[in-house]
């Protein structure tokens, strides 16, 4: 049976809706929720297309809108269809789309042609994509001026850029309990909105933003050690695009050392984390002389997930350990805010000519020179750090 | 698979010094200590010295704390041997070594002949 | 440091003859002790770590054994592939120290 309706189904997730002039929206389409295709036609009175229109289409991968009276697509038009891959807007009323509108999509085409696009800055990133092919862009005409066939480029005078943001900050050191100002400086053309990104930072400071473009400030108050490799991020938006600049906030504290028991892996290692910053210097103790390190016995740092914490962990080293290294391993730490010490005691095989009043008095023996500190370890796989 | 490449050869005069090199790859180069072992012709193997490509800490033989200095380029991988006021005893073949899954040298560079001659 | 003292020097044996290296130890040095084959104008080979643990890919007619001061490198059976240099180092700390070498020629 034909369809009278206004949008018809089309298999069985899509709609196409080609009845001339009878949709001013696309609000409250029937059936909407599974929709993957939406075809519309010969609408002049559709000029808006605005995030509202398209709520509840969270499937849609294909929307075409081709032959209507399209003038204006929001900047989050398509904020609630990002499977969106397939977008034909073309023969509308269209002088422009921002590069928001497109922003967070994977399009594999995007279909322009027959709009009265106006060539301007804001069109920058279209014509970039035309340039460099992607996602099958097809525009065909872009005017600069009055109705042309040819695509025209903006002129070599157009100096189209996305905004510059630089965040000074302060030059001295930053200890615990200090205020840190920060001040983020935009240069651009056509400037519409900057703002801090401050997701890492909670319970790290108290922030008081103030300021508005071209020069936007923020106050760290009360900051802690926690502060310490968080962004803090600034960023700017114009008709071009966006721009943002990260930087971290280094916050002076004294070292901090751990030791724990040690552990046989596939090698021994006497596990240690340290803090500070800067990051502290490390010298080894063994019964309270200087350890000189050596490929039997080494300070090995675990490779760390975490990028965004000043603690490093790692392990004191000992391949092959015999009786000649029991004893006491002391970890020294030390920065320019502080020092700080942990000892533990290990023993990792028992000293074959310790004499035992019960045992038979040896003929001769040859003992070990127990001032060494490079005798040593156990094995190790061939990528377990280190040997 | 791990690898150590060594140039074949090197001629030097006397009193002169020279630097030699050890390209790694296949491995984790920061991960091991680099190890140099001399030999003479027709002589026995002597321990040199080793270094640690993490953070260039070094440690030798006594009989060649003068004569040897290790250094590393961690960018290029690299391990290199500088001999300084060579003599004639310094006519050797200069091996780079690194352990394997033991404390044992399981890999070994092919080793550079140098020669010193006026 | 620790001197390791190996013998015999050199060594005249014909294929298929089981002949055994040995290898001193200044001191006491547990089990820590490797063994290396080295043929004429090429690199040593890893035969044997920790006394007696073989190598990847070596043969098992080569077999180690010892420990404290006392080592000793068999190769039962030779084959013509054997012949060459041997040498005993430890790995107990450093500086780690060869012994003198033992030449394995064919009769």
């Known amino acids: 049976a034909s369809c009278r309706e206004v949008c018809c189904p089309v298999g069985p997730s899509g709609l196409r809706c080609t009845r001339a002039g009878s949709l001013d929206t696309l609000r409250g389409l029937r059936g909407a929720g599974n929709l993957t295709e939406l075809y519309v036609e010969n609408q002049q009175h559709l000029q808006r297309l605005e995030f509202e229109d398209l709520q509840g289409l969270g499937e849609l991968r294909s929307l075409t809108i081709v032959k209507s009276g399209l003038r204006f697509v929001a900047p989050d038009a398509f904020r609630f269809t990002p499977r969106l891959s397939h977008l034909n807007l073309s023969s509308n009323a269209l002088e422009s789309l921002s590069w928001k509108t497109v922003q967070g999509l994977s399009l594999q085409d995007l279909t322009l042609s027959g709009n009265p696009l106006h060539c301007s800055c804001a069109l920058f990133w279209l014509q970039r994509w035309e340039q460099e092919g992607l996602c099958g862009v097809h525009t065909q005409t872009l005017h600069d001026s009055g109705p042309g066939d040819q695509f025209l480029p903006l002129g070599h005078n157009t100096s189209c850029g996305v905004p510059t943001v630089k965040i000074q900050m302060p030059n001295d050191s930053v200890e615990v309990g200090d205020d840190v100002f920060l001040q983020c400086q935009v240069e651009g053309l056509a400037l519409q909105q900057a703002d801090w990104i401050l997701t890492e930072l909670e319970g790290a400071a108290t922030v008081k933003k103030f300021g508005d473009l071209p020069s936007l400030g923020l106050i760290l108050v009360n900051v802690t050690s926690d502060l310490n490799k968080k962004n803090v991020t600034c960023w700017a938006e114009n008709d071009v695009g966006r721009a943002e600049v990260s930087v971290q906030v280094s916050v002076s504290f004294p070292a901090s050392v751990h030791l724990g028991l040690a552990v046989e892996q596939h090698h021994w290692c006497i596990p240690f984390s340290v803090d500070g910053q800067p990051a502290p210097s490390l010298r080894w103790l063994f019964n309270g002389s200087v350890l000189n390190e050596t490929s039997f016995i080494f300070t090995q740092f675990l490779e760390s997930a975490l990028t965004n914490e000043t603690m490093r962990h790692g392990c004191l080293r000992l391949n092959q350990p015999t009786h000649v290294n029991n004893g006491n391993y002391t970890l020294l730490a030390a920065n320019p805010y502080g020092q700080a010490a942990a000892s533990v005691m290990a023993a990792f095989m028992d000293n074959p000519f310790e004499f035992n009043p019960e045992d038979p008095i040896p003929v001769s023996f040859s003992p070990v020179d127990g001032n060494s500190t490079s005798r040593d370890p156990v094995e190790k796989k061939d990528e377990t750090p280190f040997g | 698979q791990v690898q150590l490449q060594q140039p074949g050869a090197e001629l030097v005069k006397p009193g002169a010094s020279v630097k030699l090199s050890c390209k790694a790859s296949?491995?984790?180069?920061?991960?091991?200590?680099m190890h140099w072992v001399k030999q003479r012709p027709g002589q026995g193997l002597e321990w040199i010295g080793e270094?640690?490509?993490?953070?260039?800490?070094?440690n030798y033989d006594e009989k060649f704390k003068t004569k040897a200095t290790l250094t590393i380029d961690k960018s290029s991988r690299t391990a290199y041997i500088q001999l300084s006021s060579l003599t004639s005893e310094d006519s050797a073949v200069y091996y780079c070594?690194?352990?394997?899954?033991?404390?044992?040298?399981?890999?070994w560079g092919q080793g550079t002949l140098v020669t010193v001659s006026a | 440091d620790i001197q390791m003292t190996q013998s015999p020097a050199s060594l005249s044996a014909t294929v298929g003859e089981t002949v055994t290296i040995t290898c001193r130890a200044s001191?006491?040095?547990?089990?820590?002790v490797a063994w290396y084959q080295q043929k004429q104008g090429k690199s040593p080979q890893l035969l044997v770590h920790?006394?007696?643990t073989l190598a990847e890919g070596v043969p098992s007619r080569f077999s180690g054994s010892g420990s404290g001061t006392q080592f000793s490198l068999k190769i039962n059976g030779l084959h013509p592939e054997d012949f060459g240099s041997y040498y005993c180092?430890?790995?107990?700390?450093?500086?780690?120290?060869f012994g003198a070498g033992t030449k394995l020629e064919l009769k």
């Open positions: 070594a690194k352990y394997g899954n033991y404390v044992a040298f399981a890999f």
């Open positions: 296949g491995y984790t180069f920061t991960s091991y200590w």
């Open positions: 270094i640690n490509p993490n953070n260039g800490l070094t």
């Open positions: 001191e006491n040095i547990y089990s820590y």
């Open positions: 920790n006394a007696k």
């Open positions: 180092q430890h790995h107990y700390g450093i500086p780690l120290t």
